[in-house]
């Protein structure tokens, strides 16, 4: 009877109710594999999700997130809150991003502003709440003598604009 | 348990015309239901489906002249607007394109011409 | 949309002889593929879904198979219920891409 079983194609499912037969998945329900006794019930992508690839008898719906929010976990299995750039998420809503980090992003956390001084750079463009500091060259190689197309920005570390 | 398309007949150029498929025997929101045409001596032609969650997909060159719908749970109808004589053909309605046991009605034949 | 080229248009072969027939999906479409055979004034029958699956009541001379976007219909042991036209549609469903387009159709028939 196992035999029997096996010869049923992905989606189908091996009907015990009829001789082992192999009946096709019904609507909403599928099985990616042969040899199934049954067809798994379909995703369905309703609330805060919506459909990206309907179910067929082999496999399974795929969703994505409405507008406003984006996925997060192996496929799609949660849908968070975008935020503003400039923001993150937290427990009580999306809040700006403290003084000295940014986030470029609808989703995450904000970051630090790169360190420009760690890799002996100087700032060249100061950074935002959506925006890193741009790091632009050496102080050393902005000395007298050394050539130089654009004059240096003041430095301010870790990359201050006044807000 | 079948499926039949209705509502097929000779129209005018700029007429509109609604085409209506029945299920008998089964639920049709519980499928995905998908519009196909042929034309006269020519090959298979999709239209567009309604999944059985409701979601509506067209092929791109019917997008805005045809519009699927499901006013209940036994019928999905085809609006088709600003019909020339290219839109000659015998439609079909089918279950279930992605399933292993799809069905189709026997069609309904579209003629337009002046 | 997905785009089907289907070849060839049309191939005369002997009974008991072998028919291959492919399609060529203009993007990765993956398994989502069915083979559908058409006799002159009937509706479309199911042959062949997910790619290579075979529907149900169909003879094991019909056979599908997958090579990235490119599939293929094999029909051996041609028998002359097999003089028919033969499409093959994509099933994709979903937003990313517009499926359901079907290939231009193969019509076999006999030598």
């Known amino acids: 009877l196992q035999d029997l079983c096996s010869n049923c194609p992905a989606g189908t499912f091996c009907d015990n109710n009829r001789s082992q037969i192999c009946s096709p998945c019904p609507p909403n329900s599928f099985s990616s594999a042969g040899g199934q006794r049954t067809c798994d019930i379909c995703r369905q992508c309703k609330g805060v999700f919506k459909t990206r690839k309907e179910c067929s008898s082999t496999s399974n719906a795929e969703c994505d997130c409405i507008s406003g929010y984006h996925c997060l976990g192996a496929e799609c299995s949660m849908c968070e809150q975008d935020c503003k750039q400039g923001q993150e998420l937290t427990k009580k809503g999306c809040k700006d991003c403290c003084f000295g980090t940014f986030n470029d992003q609808k989703r995450g956390i904000c970051r630090p502003w790169t360190n420009c001084s760690l890799d002996g750079k100087s700032v060249l463009v100061n950074g935002t709440k959506e925006r890193d500091v741009v790091c632009g060259p050496s102080p050393a190689d902005l000395s007298p003598g050394a050539s130089s197309a654009t004059p240096p920005a003041p430095a301010r570390e870790p990359g201050h604009s006044p807000q | 348990r079948s499926l039949e398309e209705s509502g097929g007949r000779l129209v005018t150029p700029g007429t509109p015309l609604t085409l209506t498929c029945t299920a008998s025997?089964?639920?049709?929101?519980?499928?995905?239901m998908q519009w196909v045409r042929q034309a006269p001596g020519k090959g298979l032609e999709y239209i567009g489906t309604i999944s059985s969650g409701g979601n509506v997909y067209y092929a791109s060159w019917a997008r805005g002249r045809f519009t699927i719908s499901r006013p209940s749970s036994t019928t999905v109808d085809l609006k088709m607007t600003s019909l020339t004589t290219e839109d000659t053909a015998t439609y079909f309605c089918a279950r279930d394109s992605g399933y292993s046991d799809p069905m189709w009605g026997p069609g309904t034949l579209v003629t337009v011409s002046s | 949309d997905v785009v089907m080229t289907q070849t060839p248009a049309s191939v005369s072969e002997p009974v008991g002889g072998t028919v291959t027939i492919k399609c060529q999906a203009s993007q990765n479409i993956r398994t989502y593929l069915s083979w559908y055979q058409q006799k002159p004034g009937q509706r479309p029958k199911l042959l062949i879904y997910a790619a290579a699956n075979l529907a149900s009541g169909v003879p094991s001379r019909f056979s599908g198979s997958r090579s990235g976007t490119e599939f293929t219909l094999t029909i051996s042991d041609l028998e002359c219920a097999d003089a028919a036209t033969y499409y093959c549609q994509c099933t994709y469903l979903g937003t990313d891409y517009v499926g359901g387009a079907f290939g231009g159709g193969t019509e076999v028939e006999f030598k």
């Open positions: 025997g089964f639920t049709i929101s519980s499928y995905h």
